[in-house]
């Protein structure tokens, strides 16, 4: 058992049929010695008397808010939450496995540049009685500071009969060094509490591995005189790290015919312009990736050829 | 380069960009294969890293590129020795068309561009002996290549910036 916050405790339980559970001793926070009784949640049923109450916590029915009273007056409270461990693995019932980039991915994180700022998000089908807290650091044995903002409900989607909620948080490394080679990973820890169930989720990554640039901007087409060719140009996204001579991007460009089945010609270039044949009803697209490290490609930026 | 002369920025840029390509073809990203384990904070200390105070940022390069270039060269020699060690030459054997050989030669080539004959900078101690089990060796290869990818990315940025802004 450990204290999550004042008067709120997490009981770690091995979860299997007929498990013995954990013995927990609750102490009433009062100088009084006599006439103390204990109740659980809103039930008026007296569970025991005396300054301490010993309980065997085996299931969710044993968790909840315990109150000690004297003469009809509440003296102190303790809230017990459960953290389940099944077959040696902590439960992950609250958040949804996003399965990207691999199974058991509950937290996903992305960065638009090397500034030390990143966003993490997670999914759940649970709407009410759900709370989160987030902590982050660089490294774990001698952690360096990372400051996370508020968790916000960033999207709601209907998936069949279920509603899915996406929560996200933005964090910023306190002393980021964009040009250095990261030695220790960023750690992100999310505590999730649903009713009386406590769970924690972690993700560990280097910023370089979660980079996903914004799409190139100001995508423009300029027809060349007396030719079927057009000159296309684009710019680095505003959110990308500067100077661009140091933080360089590479680009993938393609012309896509009206039919999705039509063969797409893809060309890779480090330049911010190209000459292509752009037929009527086709569209031109460009995406960006860090030039020197194979992290994610940006989403496509597109313009119609006509 | 030693003694304050400028490197052949454009040549270094080309070779470092080639190194990036080779490092990724030697160990492509296998679904974000997570090679970090407990205690990794300690094992990552074995390899040289380009750190914040090494002057490899744009401002540091403008002020005095020598500190950064020396750091890069130390790293190149370190990785070149690793790729030539029995971690890579022992079992399991590399495939005949493995890019590791080219990567090894390119590391040597770039380190020589940064230090012509006759100059010797101190280099970092070569790493501890290779593990005995083939599977351990294979895992160590992956870790070394992942670490090398990060190192050469920073080096390539340095040379690209140098070629664009510091070339005579």
């Amino acid at each position: 058992i450990w204290e999550l916050k004042k008067d709120v405790y997490v009981v770690e339980l091995d979860w299997y049929p007929d498990a013995p559970g954990e013995m927990v001793v609750l102490t009433c926070d009062t100088p009084e010695e006599d006439g103390i009784t204990w109740t659980l949640d809103q039930s008026g049923e007296v569970l025991g008397s005396g300054k301490t109450l010993t309980i065997q916590v085996k299931e969710f029915g044993d968790a909840g808010q315990y109150t000690c009273h004297k003469g009809g007056e509440a003296l102190s409270h303790s809230l017990l939450l459960l953290h389940k461990k099944e077959d040696g693995i902590w439960s992950t019932d609250v958040l949804k496995d996003q399965k990207e980039p691999k199974n058991k991915t509950f937290l996903r994180c992305e960065a638009k540049n090397y500034s030390g700022r990143f966003t993490c998000w997670w999914l759940t089908t649970i709407s009410t009685d759900l709370t989160f807290s987030v902590k982050s650091s660089r490294g774990s044995s001698n952690p360096q500071g990372v400051t996370c903002g508020a968790v916000t409900l960033s999207a709601e989607r209907v998936r069949g009969d279920n509603k899915e909620y996406e929560y996200s948080v933005e964090c910023q490394e306190d002393s980021a060094c964009p040009a250095a080679e990261e030695r220790l990973p960023i750690e992100v820890m999310v505590d999730a509490i649903h009713k009386l169930k406590y769970e924690n989720y972690t993700s560990s990554f280097f910023i370089r591995d979660i980079i996903k640039p914004d799409p190139p901007k100001n995508l423009q087409l300029k027809p060349l005189k007396n030719s079927r060719q057009v000159e296309v140009s684009w710019e680095y996204p505003d959110t990308w790290s500067t100077p661009h001579s140091y933080f360089s991007l590479t680009f993938c460009i393609q012309v896509q015919g009206k039919s999705k089945r039509e063969k797409k010609d893809r060309i890779f270039t480090d330049k911010t312009s190209a000459t292509v044949i752009c037929r009527k009803n086709a569209s031109f697209s460009v995406q960006a990736q860090d030039r020197y490290y194979s992290s994610s490609w940006s989403e496509w930026a597109s313009v119609p050829c006509s | 380069v030693p003694g304050g002369s400028s490197p052949a920025w454009a040549q270094c840029q080309q070779l470092s960009q080639k190194l990036c390509t080779l490092a990724w073809s030697a160990h492509p990203l296998v679904g974000h294969m997570d090679l970090r384990e407990e205690g990794d904070e300690e094992t990552t200390n074995d390899v040289p890293h380009i750190q914040c105070g090494d002057g490899c940022d744009p401002q540091g390069l403008r002020d005095n590129s020598q500190f950064c270039l020396q750091r890069i060269r130390q790293g190149l020699i370190f990785y070149e020795k690793l790729l030539g060690s029995d971690i890579f030459t022992g079992e399991p054997s590399l495939l005949p068309d493995s890019p590791v050989g080219q990567l090894h030669a390119s590391l040597l080539g770039l380190s020589q561009l940064l230090q012509p004959e006759g100059h010797h900078w101190e280099t970092q101690q070569i790493p501890s002996p290779s593990p005995s089990q083939p599977w351990q060796r294979l895992l160590l290869r992956f870790k070394i290549l992942r670490s090398l990818q990060a190192f050469v990315a920073v080096a390539a940025r340095v040379f690209a910036h140098g070629a664009a802004t510091l070339s005579p």
Partner: nanobody, 125 residues
Amino acid sequence: EVQLVESGGRLVQAGGSLRLSCAASGRTFDSNPMGWFRQAPGKKREFVAIISGNGGITNYANSVKGRFTISRDNAKNTIYLQMNSLKPEDTAVYYCAASGLYGSGSVYDLMYDYWGQGTQVTVSS
């Protein structure tokens, strides 16, 4: 210093309506769940209603569902409790609570970090 100040409580006839307000100062709670709890004489403090940071998710105690509505105005850093079809058993001191956590909030009062002084609601038959 964080302060939550409730207002709007008074004596009202059964079947009547009231609107409680809770204004927060000292910090913004626009991303945090806030809620209402109540305590009748000689009884435990009980959960009434909670609302998520953006106001999109609400949760009510069964005893008030369909009669009470919780809402918030983040620009004013204020939450409200519209109470309709009041019953004598709704008589209690109503407390506003704010959490330092995120999400849709908890029905347990110990999960809240900031509390108001309370406003008295008395429903006469």
